[in-house]
Structure formats: structure tokens, C-alpha cells
């Protein structure tokens, strides 16, 4: 007996071939011997089966001795043994229809769990293997669970259902609602304008919610809310903003914030949260601001940085076109009685310059 696997909602062709390539009598019946369809003269006739309105056959293939039955909009309960009677012989085809669905909405927040449930006909014992867009393999039986969704789980999941050495493939589109980056750091010289961008890792037809940026300045004892905003159909509107600093926010996505000036008192780290309508939980993105200041006071040339820097970052002062350099894995470096010329303050990570500031030292006569 031939076994054919089908997908719920899909269309399947059950083949039945006669030895002679000519138009002949044929009938398709179910396991209860109820006629589904057949031929009477040149007419396709339908029987009393509940399948009849979804069953069809291709007249153009009858001349080739092919009397297939096509079943549209498959249901789990269509799983049955179907009998094709042609040329005084009977061909049996066992059809097994499976369905695979996500238990919840397929738009899930990062960190939430995903459960896929397999619908299968009674008496079947299928196995399921799913592969995430990032290449993660998960196996299961009637259910498959992914406890904590990550950004890279967004996309098309491919699940293979196996039964009797046959397979059928399901594709399920999962959207993980998250920002493109978990964290980002902006490096700026004192006085420069700061641009913070928070691109989303997904697109939705309608995007509505509300958000807030909390800021913990390095110099401050507690964090404070810098801005709150609403999002309606991808349009951003500011609800409340602090007076110091007076942030500006873009009206369109991606979420975009502008700080007019980078100042040492603003250096620190922030947490932007976004709560989406009809979703439990919030999206988060951490943002850091590192500010550099180079100053000369009397005989002392100083370079300082404020904000969250890793201990492996190097701060250097060097005289342009000269070998004179002072470097430290610290947040401040200085040179006493510096030579006249253009000095560069550099913040670097393994040789890669993250931030630089130039200061001119004039000769003192």
C-alpha cells in the first residue's frame, strides 16, 4: 500500500495508473467503500462522500492512463485509505494529513517561548524535526518548544514531519520582536551633537505602542527618565522630555534621538524600552555615551573620558609627527609641560581608534 503525506489546507494528488494508455472506467472510493468520484461516459461523476466537493480529476491525463484524484483544502480527517478501481484491479493509497501550528501569535518578543503543535491522524506516530533560520535543530513529537527566543530565531522555520519513511515539510514564519542591537555605544567629543538610533529588527504593517528612555549618568546617583513617547502607526510623538538635556526625537521610524551637545555630565548609559500594543513585555536596547575632553591648563595637558568604557581601552596623548606619546588603560592621561604643536587624544581598542580629539599647544615664551 502506497503512503502519501499531506499538509492541512494544502492540495494533494493521489495517483492511479492503468496499464493501457487509454480512457477507461475508474472509481475512487474511501475505506468505507463510499464513492468519491469516477467516470461515466466522458463525464466526471461525484459520489456522496464528504470529500466530493473538494475532489477533482484531470481529464487531460485520462488518455495517458492516469486517473489521479486531487483533493483540495486537506483536513486532518481526510486521512484514510483510498481505493482506486480501474481495469478490474484495485490500488490502495493511504493518505495521512498533518498540520503544524504555532500555539500563540507568531510575533513574539525576544526571550518569550515558542510552542509548535502537530495535529496528526489517530494511530499515526510521527516525528518532527525543526530547523531555525539560524541553523538550530530541535526535535520533538506532538509538540516542539523553544524556551527563549533570540533575535536570530526570526525568519522561516522549516519543520519536517516523518512517518513511514515519508516526509512532509512545513514552513512557519516567526517574527522575533526586538531591536537590531542589544547594546550600542556612541563615542563623542565634548560639545558635539549626539545621534542615538534604535532600529527595529522587524517590520509590522501597523506598529503602535509607547516607549521611554531612562538614563543613568556616570556622575549621578540615580537614573532619570529623559524622554517618553508614543508610537502610532509608525508615527512617533513625544509625550514628555526633560529640560536638561533637551532631547529631540524623529517623527518616523527608526526611533531616533538627538542630544544637542555631548557633555561630561551626560556620559553614562541608558535603557530604551518599547511596549507594543497587544503584546506582553517590552523591547529593550541599551545605549552608552562616552564623552572625551582634552584641555590645557597652565603647564598641564589633560585628556579625559567619561562614560562606560571597558578596562582594556587605551587612552593616549601624542604629539603629531613626533614620537612623544603617553598611553594608559585609564580614563585620564596627562602630560606636564607639553611641547608646542598639535596634540591628539586617542581612545582606542586593540589599535582601532574609537574617538579622537585634537588640541593645539602654543609655545610659552
Amino acid at each position: 500500500k502506497k503512503v502519501v503525506l499531506g499538509k492541512k489546507g494544502d492540495t494533494v494528488e493521489l495517483t492511479c495508473n492503468a496499464s493501457q494508455k487509454k480512457n477507461t472506467q475508474f472509481h475512487w472510493k474511501n475505506s468505507n467503500q463510499i464513492k468519491i468520484l469516477g467516470i461515466q461516459g466522458l463525464f466526471l461523476t461525484k459520489g456522496p462522500s464528504k470529500l466530493s466537493d473538494r475532489a477533482d480529476s484531470r481529464k487531460s491525463l485520462w488518455d495517458q492512463g492516469c486517473f489521479s484524484m486531487i483533493i483540495k483544502n486537506l483536513k486532518i480527517e481526510d486521512s484514510d485509505t483510498y481505493i482506486c478501481e480501474v481495469e478490474n484491479k484495485k490500488e490502495e493509497v493511504e493518505l495521512l494529513v498533518f498540520g503544524l501550528t504555532a500555539n500563540s501569535d507568531t510575533h513574539l518578543l525576544e526571550g518569550q517561548s515558542l510552542t509548535l503543535t502537530l495535529e496528526s491522524p489517530p494511530g499515526s506516530s510521527p516525528s518532527v524535526k525543526c530547523r531555525s533560520p539560524g541553523g538550530k535543530n530541535i526535535q520533538g513529537g506532538r509538540t516542539i518548544s523553544v524556551p527563549q527566543l533570540e533575535r536570530q530565531d526570526s525568519g522561516t522555520w522549516t519543520c519536517t514531519v516523518s512517518q513511514d519513511q515519508k516526509t512532509v515539510e512545513f514552513k512557519i514564519d516567526i517574527v522575533v520582536l526586538a531591536f537590531q542591537k542589544a547594546s550600542s555605544t556612541v563615542y563623542k567629543k565634548e560639545g558635539e551633537q549626539v545621534e542615538f538610533s534604535f532600529p527595529l529588527a522587524f517590520t509590522l504593517e501597523k506598529l503602535t505602542g509607547s516607549g521611554e528612555l531612562w538614563w543613568q549618568a556616570e556622575r549621578a546617583s540615580s537614573s532619570k527618565s529623559w524622554i517618553t513617547f508614543d508610537l502610532k502607526n509608525k508615527e512617533v510623538s513625544v509625550k514628555r522630555v526633560t529640560q536638561d538635556p533637551k532631547l529631540q526625537m524623529g517623527k518616523k521610524l527608526p526611533l531616533h534621538l538627538t542630544l544637542p551637545q555631548a557633555l561630561p555630565q551626560y556620559a553614562g548609559s541608558g535603557n530604551l524600552t518599547l511596549a507594543l500594543e497587544a503584546k506582553t513585555g517590552k523591547l529593550h536596547q541599551e545605549v552608552n555615551l562616552v564623552v572625551m575632553r582634552a584641555t590645557q591648563f597652565q603647564e598641564n595637558l589633560t585628556c579625559e573620558v567619561w562614560g562606560p568604557t571597558s578596562p582594556k581601552l587605551t587612552l593616549s596623548l601624542k604629539l603629531e609627527n613626533k614620537g612623544a606619546t603617553v598611553s594608559k588603560q585609564a580614563k585620564a592621561v596627562w602630560v606636564l609641560n607639553p611641547e608646542a604643536g598639535m596634540w591628539q587624544c586617542l581612545l582606542s581598542d586593540s589599535g582601532q581608534v574609537l574617538l579622537e580629539s585634537n588640541i593645539k599647544v602654543v609655545p610659552t615664551w
Partner: antibody, heavy 115, light 107 residues
Framework: QVQLQQWGAGLLKPSETLSLTCAVY????????WSWIRQSPGKGLEWIGE???????NYNPSLKSRVTISVDTSKNQFSLKLSSVTAADTAVYYC?????????WGQGTLVTVSS | DIQMTQSPSSVSASVGDRVTITCRAS??????LAWYQQKPGKAPKLLIY???SFQSGVPSRFSGSGSGTDFTLTISSLQTEDFATYYC?????????FGQGTRLEIK
């Protein structure tokens, strides 16, 4: 609701090979046959050929020697290649879904053969 | 190949008129016939299949009849949106063939 979206080169020189692809969105790819049909002012609607998910093909005998229809089930796409084109192959080419009747069609691609 | 011949090749009518288009097959095709409507710059749209069955969403003013070699498409009361070209197609045997079309114009 099934949607068929087709694309391919619109301007060819005589003797070149016409190449078109049709992608199927939002419906079942299995169980159906996927056809190519062309329409020219001179010959009206002309069925070129068809393919199913398994790669089984049927072609119009008048074009069979020049036609190849192939399928990529991983992408729910099927393609048409028509070799050694002449000005007589200038037409609007359509992809369509069929069991016995063409119930869903692509938007059509005008292919012009000119030296 | 089965030849499909439509008549008339064009017809002029007014809104509200009853219009009949015929299609003749060069050999018997039982009821393996479909009717399509095509508007300029668009793909054909299936109206009637199996000679007399309605495709979903098709208005009831369209009807099909016939069997064997002679078939008819009738529009009981013409609407503005019905002015188009109509084609018949046989699904009895390969190669599938179409009629040459009937152009329905506003009088």
C-alpha cells in the same frame, strides 16, 4: 488567496533563449499543475506547457522541441525556457495554476523579439 | 488538437442587454469547458468551469450551458464592467486550446 508573480527579460534578439520565472505565494504548491500560456495578437491565447511539484511535465506539441519547464519546490517557483526565439514568439507570457481550468494567473510579461 | 471556435468575434450591446456568446469544439469534449473574461492589460479571469459551474465571486448574471461540442455563455443583464473580451477553453485533452475570443463592446 494564491498569488502568482512572474519576471524575466522583456527584450530578446532572434535565436536567443527566452527565460521567465513565476513564484507562487499564499497557496498550496503541491497537487496543482503550473502552466505557461502566451497571448499574441496573431495567435490569441496559446497554452505552452505545464509542470507539477514532482517535475512531471506536459508540453504543447507545437512548441515541445524548444520548451523546457522546470520547478524549484524549495522556493515555490517554476520557470520557462524557450530556445531559438523568432519574431513570432513576441507575446505576453502568463504563468497560471491549473487542475483542469486556469483559476489563478500571473500579471503577464511582454516579451518582444527584435533584431 | 481540438479547435475551439467562438462566435461572434465581436458584439456591440448596451447596459441592461442580454448577450449570448457561443463556442464550438471540433470534437466532443463532454462538459470539459471553461469561460474567461479579459480586460485590456490584465490577465484572463476564470468565470465558468465544467461548462456551467460558477467560479466563486462571479456575479449570477453570468451563466454557462452546453455539452459535447456546443457551448454558450450568457450575460443576462449587461453591466458597465462586463465590457471585455471573453474566451472559451477546453480541458478535455492536451494541448489545452482556447477560442479566438469575443470582444464585447458598448453600443
Amino acid at each position: 488567496q494564491v498569488q502568482l508573480q512572474q519576471w524575466g527579460a522583456g527584450l530578446l534578439k532572434p535565436s536567443e533563449t527566452l527565460s521567465l520565472t513565476c513564484a507562487v505565494y499564499g497557496g498550496s504548491f503541491s497537487g496543482y499543475y503550473w502552466s505557461w500560456i502566451r497571448q499574441s495578437p496573431g495567435k490569441g491565447l496559446e497554452w505552452i506547457g505545464e509542470i507539477n511539484q514532482s517535475g512531471s511535465t506536459n508540453y504543447n506539441p507545437s512548441l515541445k522541441s524548444r520548451v523546457t519547464i522546470s520547478v524549484d519546490t524549495s522556493k515555490n517557483q517554476f520557470s520557462l525556457k524557450l530556445s531559438s526565439v523568432t519574431a513570432a514568439d513576441t507575446a505576453v507570457y502568463y504563468c497560471a495554476r491549473v487542475i483542469n481550468w486556469f483559476d489563478s494567473w500571473g500579471q503577464g510579461t511582454l516579451v518582444t523579439v527584435s533584431s | 488538437d481540438i479547435q475551439m471556435t467562438q462566435s461572434p468575434s465581436s458584439v456591440s450591446a448596451s447596459v441592461g442587454d442580454r448577450v449570448t456568446i457561443t463556442c464550438r469544439a471540433s470534437q466532443g469534449i463532454s462538459s470539459w469547458l471553461a469561460w474567461y473574461q479579459q480586460k485590456p492589460g490584465k490577465a484572463p479571469k476564470l468565470l465558468i468551469y465544467a461548462a456551467s459551474s460558477f467560479q466563486s465571486g462571479v456575479p449570477s448574471r453570468f451563466s454557462g450551458s452546453g455539452s459535447g461540442t456546443d457551448f454558450t455563455l450568457t450575460i443576462s443583464s449587461l453591466q458597465t464592467e462586463d465590457f471585455a473580451t471573453y474566451y472559451c477553453q477546453q480541458a478535455n485533452s492536451f494541448p489545452y486550446t482556447f477560442g479566438q475570443g469575443t470582444r464585447l463592446e458598448i453600443k
